[in-house]
């Protein structure tokens, strides 16, 4: 079953068949005897009841108000009323572009990554029984495809696939020919798949410390939204009351990735904290990356080359 028209604001193109379906449809079937009314308001005309006599272009069926076709003067507010249920839509009918096979304002944009699966299927479930044939156009040039009932493109996207694809359904109603156009603006972009998360800075860090003092070890990474960053140390994390994993700070980058940092705070440094590995790991579906910190007493730092020190 075609789902109801839940969007309160709708824009359509003049000259095409169009329908509004209210959202208490299954309820309406149950109470056949209940009075169901459709109204229109526009300009000075408030709440004018609609019926097939209002216009030869309007048809009413159960849950649906149909336009054969919709025209510019159909712009306005529409109401469905049944008992204490009311649904309202604001309809804006725009001019058809006479110089193109589609109207720019009625285009759905889609971004497809190069080499990823790309599909366009021309379907219209509401009008399907009335559709005689359907054609698919790319940039207003007809594509020769085998199936003229539901033309379909299924392929791995290439940059040449970019363009405007218009599905045009041709249908008959009461001896007249109508068409319905649905256009997609397909943009092919470079692969935007997840980055391999990376920990910033050297993989091994010796940190010069003094016993009894505190130290903060900062671990930063560039990662995807679902990637995680965590510290591992000692036998079992949390066994040392002097070691605290601080809250993660995460900020989104302009590219839609995340910059995350997590600090390990070690208070009142003791002998047991020296010369052991404090590992920071970033994990993603694609694998893990780890960097290590080793606390070294300041007095011992002469044994270690200068370039491995961090503050």
């Amino acid at each position: 079953a075609e789902s109801c028209t839940s969007r309160p604001h709708i824009t359509v193109v003049e000259g095409e068949p169009f329908y509004l379906k209210h959202c208490s449809c299954s309820l309406a079937h149950e109470i056949e005897t209940t009075t169901k009314s459709w109204y229109k308001s526009s300009g000075s005309q408030e709440h004018v009841e609609l019926n097939p006599r209002s216009s030869s272009r309007i048809a009413l069926h159960d849950c649906v108000l149909e336009f054969w076709p919709v025209e510019l003067n159909d712009t306005g507010s529409y109401f469905f009323q049944m008992k204490n249920y009311t649904q309202k839509w604001k309809l804006n009918v725009i001019r058809r572009n006479k110089h193109s096979c589609f109207t720019e304002r009625q285009v759905t944009s889609k971004i497809v990554e190069v080499k990823k699966f790309f599909q366009i299927t021309c379907e219209n479930s509401y009008y399907q029984t009335l559709v005689n044939s359907t054609s698919l156009y790319k940039n207003c040039k007809k594509l020769l495809l085998e199936n003229n009932k539901n033309p379909t493109i299924k392929k791995n996207a290439e940059f040449e696939d970019q363009g405007y694809y218009s599905c045009v359904h041709f249908l008959h109603h009461n001896g007249k020919l109508f068409n319905i156009t649905k256009t997609f603006n397909i943009t092919i972009v470079e692969d935007r798949s997840n980055i391999v998360p990376v920990l910033l800075g050297p993989k091994l860090n010796h940190v010069a410390v003094e016993l009894g003092k505190n130290v903060r070890l900062n671990c930063s990474a560039l990662l995807n939204e679902e990637d995680v960053i965590y510290w591992m140390f000692g036998e079992e994390n949390g066994s040392d009351p002097n070691i605290h994993e601080e809250k993660e700070m995460r900020i989104m980058t302009p590219e839609g990735k995340w910059h995350a940092s997590k600090v390990l705070r070690i208070e009142n440094i003791g002998e047991s904290n020296l010369n052991v590995l404090y590992n920071c790991t970033v994990a993603s579906t694609g694998g893990t990356d780890t960097k290590s910190f080793i606390l070294v007493r300041k007095a011992d730092m002469a044994d270690i080359p200068g370039h491995v020190f961090t503050r």
């Epitope: 971004i111 990554e113 990823k116 935007r192 798949s193 997840n194 939204e225 679902e226 995680v228 965590y230 510290w231 994390n237 994993e245 809250k247 993660e248 700070m249 995460r250 900020i251 989104m252 839609g256 995350a260």
Partner: antibody
């Protein structure tokens, strides 16, 4: 201001399908994942799945692999949840959500869409 | 998949009291945990993210703690507006499952 606006309540028959929408504002939908959560009447919360609108990549919870399809239209900043072969078990409020800007937690939620499956 | 076990399932308390709700994860989730409050007929609202960080605009009467697999939400000096249902949720790896919820009622 970040907002997630969901479509209205749906009353559908068993075996039918329904498509719910979640229109976002205050941010670019391509920059952040959109998640869907199910809550049956007087029950807990269940993670349905998520979409990365930038590339259409989706993940689903174990109970929703064959039940749900999540899509997104970046031109209208809208995410969709389609549910098929509906049964009374699918009667629930469905929420869309996104993370806050700073980490682990859904900082922003839609107002929810009630789907009622009834003959 | 990580499972979250939340306790108690329901709790009665009086205004002014302090209550604690706990969540146990089936594996180490390294503080990737959020707490939410949900009032009747409303969407959940985040209280705490990253296990311990209070979300913007949340009263300091709420606090999150824990590490590894064990986490708690503490509510000090209960106020009438605190009554509702509380959920925890892990963010360690998808699916991001929720705890079963704790219904906090006025005694």
């Amino acid at each position: 201001e970040v907002q997630l606006q969901q479509s209205g309540a749906e009353l559908v028959k068993p075996g039918a399908s329904v498509k719910l929408s979640c229109t976002t504002s205050g941010f670019n939908i391509k920059d952040i994942y959109i998640y869907w959560v199910k809550q049956r009447p007087e029950q807990g919360l269940e993670w349905v799945g998520r979409i990365d609108p930038a590339n259409g990549d989706t993940k689903y919870g174990p109970n929703f692999q064959d039940k749900a399809t999540i899509t997104a239209d970046t031109s209208s900043n809208t995410a969709y949840l389609q549910l098929r072969s509906l049964t009374s078990e699918d009667t629930a409020v469905y929420y869309c959500a996104r993370r806050g800007n700073y980490g682990a937690g859904f900082g922003y939620w839609g107002q929810g869409t009630l789907v009622t499956v009834s003959a | 998949d990580i499972q979250m076990t939340q306790s108690p399932a329901s709790l009665s308390a009086s205004v002014g009291e302090t209550v604690t709700i706990t969540c146990r994860a089936s594996g180490n989730i390294h503080n990737y945990l959020a707490w939410y409050q949900q009032r009747q007929g409303k969407s959940p609202q985040i209280l705490v993210y990253n296990a311990k960080t209070l979300a913007d605009g949340v009263s300091s009467r709420f606090s999150g703690s824990g590490s590894g697999t064990q986490y708690s939400l503490n509510i000090n000096s209960l106020q009438p507006e605190d009554f509702g249902t509380y959920f925890c949720q892990h963010f360690w790896s998808t699916p991001y499952t929720f705890g079963g919820g704790t219904k906090l009622e006025i005694k």
